[in-house]
Each structure stands twice: as C-alpha cells, then as structure tokens.
C-alpha cells in the first residue's frame, strides 16, 4: 500500500478552522513571510513519502504550533483544541501505519518537513505559531489531495 | 446566582505544598474557562493559568511552570490549584474565576483564599 | 509579555469630582479582526474580589453604574469616574487579553478627601 488511510472527518477539522481563520489571520504581523503556504517542498512529494510528511507534519502542529500559541481567549481556543484533539487521532491512526512497515521516511521526507521547522525557527515563537496556524489551510487541502479519506461517523 | 466558593486559609511550612479548591454553583460548570489569580499583600494582581472544565486541558503562566498544579473534578463542580515547594514569595491570595464564554476576562470571582508560608 | 502601566498609582478625590485614571499597554490590543481593544477594568473593593467594571474598553456589563466610562483604543485608554460617589473608594485594575500571559496593571488607588 502506498497510502495510509486516514479515518478522521476532515471536514468537521476544516469547518473548526474556517470559523476561527480570520481571528487568527488577523494577528498575524508578517503576512509577507510563509511558513507553509508557497512551499514547493509539499507540492512535489512523491506518493512513497506522503504518509511519513503527514506524520512529521501532525507531529510540528501537536508539538510545536499548538503549544507556542498565545491566544487567551476560549472562543479561539475551543476550536484549535478540537483540531488538536483530531490531529491526535490522526497521530494514532498512522501510528498503526508505521507498525505494518508503511511510512517509512526518505531523505526528501526529512528534507521538506525540515524546511518547514527551519521556516519556524526563523520568527519569534508567538508570530510563528500564529503563522502556522493561520496557514493549517494549506495543511488540511493538502492532506485531502494525497490521502484518500475515509469519513468516520 | 453564580457563585465562586473558595476553601478556606492555610499556614504552611516553606517546602511544603497546598491544594486549594473551587466549587462552582449557578451555571453550567463544563460551558466556562476556571482562571486562577494571584495577589500578594494587596498589590496587583498576576494570571497563574487556565482550566477548561470540559476536558480538563490546562495553561499556566510560564512563572508559574511547575509551581501550580491545575484540576477540575466535574462530577462535583470544583476546580483545584495545588501549589507546590512553597516559600514566602507564594504568601499571597489566591483566587479563580470564572471567564467569559468567548473572552478571556474575569466575570465572577472566588472570594479568595490566603496562603501564608511561615516556619 | 505585554506589559500594563498604570496610573496615577493613588489619587485623592471628593464626592462629585470627576476622576481619570489611565491605563497603557505595551502592543496594541485592538484586534483587525472584530475592531475591538481586548481591554477590561476591574474595581477591588478593601477586603472584597475583584469586579468587572469595563471590558472591551468601553463596555459596561450589566449592573454597573454609567458613571463609569471606559475609553481609549490601540494601546492608551482611559477609565473615567463621572461624578465618584463614597462606594468607589477602591483599586482599579486594567487588564490585557490579546494573548497570553493575561496581565494586569499595578493598579490605581482610589482614596477620598
């Protein structure tokens, strides 16, 4: 198998982050800088990676984006908890992925999720994480080109 | 009438640690944030952290990272703060509150609870 | 952190005065997105909590009295007593939620003549 499935409903995490998009975008003071968002890295990965990027990937929001974020007030925080708590999920799902030996990362793998934590590590933590999450658009359309998505009830 | 009850004042000894508690009553506990405050000897007042009485996920102050300790026990409404390692910069009251649905101020307030750390 | 200067830090007034007390944030806290300050003021009482004066800047919630007014955007903003009344006798906190850690002013005491 060169795909992973993933059993998540990608639309209820695409419908969190639409009704919170604007708030975040809106503290975003660099709006010229991209952490995701023209990365050319993501467009060319082959099938053989795609499962390890969506790993290292899940991994950069859950442990990075979602804990450097300042945002104090609960009707933001609610919602990027809800994608958290999916993004887990998710993280579970590939786990049994990798035990049956199907998301083995490539130097390229390795390589593109590098350029996206470099891209990171290039702005305060604060503008970073708030970038990140402003760009989780650009995450979740490309997580629905490359897996085949089956919707859990 | 939403109310915020606080447990009452503690003397502890430095080095020791202290559990205060909470208990909500007149609203729907799991629906608010439970933020907990600090004032020392009636100066300003400092934000420790958050709880989210829905799944009990937790934001501290980084000042207060591994200093406090916050719970909730929704089968009986009340949030908990446990302080630990304590010393006399911890003397101070301590209070939760409740946030507003969507924002992060400061609706209704415990009355507090004084903690004082002496040998 | 966002840093929150208050002041005066006292101020001594009689019943009737108008008092102004001013509040100062180190970023703005006018959010693009809802062109709100994310900016509240709180009255402490001796011996009581705090109290929700202000939030929003400039919004009184319900049951506090119009003499209170909140005003002021971006990162300079004002609390005004219209006409002090003796129950005023208080500190006043201002208190930043445009991102964490939430902060508070050092505050302003409110004594009378």
């Known amino acids: 198998l060169r795909r992973c499935l993933i059993s998540t409903d990608m639309h209820h995490i695409e419908e969190s982050f639409q009704e919170i998009k604007r708030a975040i975008q809106a503290k975003d003071t660099f709006p010229n800088v991209t952490i995701l968002s023209t990365l050319e890295t993501l467009q060319i990965i082959k099938p053989l990676d795609v499962c390890c990027v969506t790993k290292n990937l899940l991994a950069f929001y859950v442990d990075r984006v979602f804990k450097d974020h300042q945002e104090p007030n609960p009707k933001i925080l609610r919602k990027i908890s809800s994608i958290a708590n999916s993004f887990l999920y998710m993280q579970k799902t590939l786990r049994q992925c990798q035990e049956q030996r199907q998301c083995h990362c490539r130097q390229e793998a390795t390589n593109a999720t590098r350029v996206i934590h470099d891209n990171y590590d290039q702005l305060e933590v604060h503008a970073a994480a708030i970038k990140s999450l402003g760009e989780l658009d650009v995450f979740l359309a490309w997580i629905n080109k490359n897996h085949e998505v089956m919707f859990s009830a | 009438e939403v109310q915020l009850q606080q447990s009452g004042p503690v003397l502890v000894k430095p080095g020791a640690s202290v559990k205060m508690s909470c208990k909500a009553s007149?609203?729907?506990?799991?629906?608010?944030?439970v933020g907990w405050v600090k004032q020392s000897h009636g100066k300003s007042l400092e934000w420790i952290g958050y709880v989210d009485p829905e799944n009990g996920y937790t934001r501290c102050n980084q000042k207060f990272k591994g200093k406090a300790t916050l719970t909730v026990d929704k089968s009986s409404s009340t949030a908990y703060m446990e302080l630990n390692s304590l010393t006399s910069e911890d003397s101070a009251v301590y209070y939760c509150a409740r946030y507003d649905y969507d924002w992060a101020w400061f609706t209704n307030w415990g009355q507090g609870t004084l903690v004082t750390v002496s040998a | 952190d966002i840093v929150m200067t208050q002041s005066p830090s006292s101020l001594a007034m009689s019943v009737g005065q108008k008092v102004t007390m001013s509040c100062k944030s180190s970023?703005?806290?006018?959010?693009?997105?809802?062109?709100?300050?994310?900016l509240a003021w709180y009255q402490q009482k001796p011996g009581q909590s705090p109290k929700l004066l202000v939030y929003?800047?400039?919004t009184r919630p319900p049951g506090v009295p119009d003499r209170f007014i909140g005003s002021g955007s971006g990162s300079d903003f004002t609390l005004t007593i219209s006409s002090v009344q003796a129950e005023d006798l208080a500190d006043y906190f201002c208190q930043q939620h445009e991102r964490l850690p939430i902060t508070f002013g050092a505050g302003t005491k409110l004594e009378l003549k």
């Open positions: 929003f800047a400039s």
């Open positions: 970023q703005s806290l006018l959010s693009s997105y809802n062109q709100k300050n994310y």
């Open positions: 007149g609203y729907k506990f799991t629906d608010y944030f």
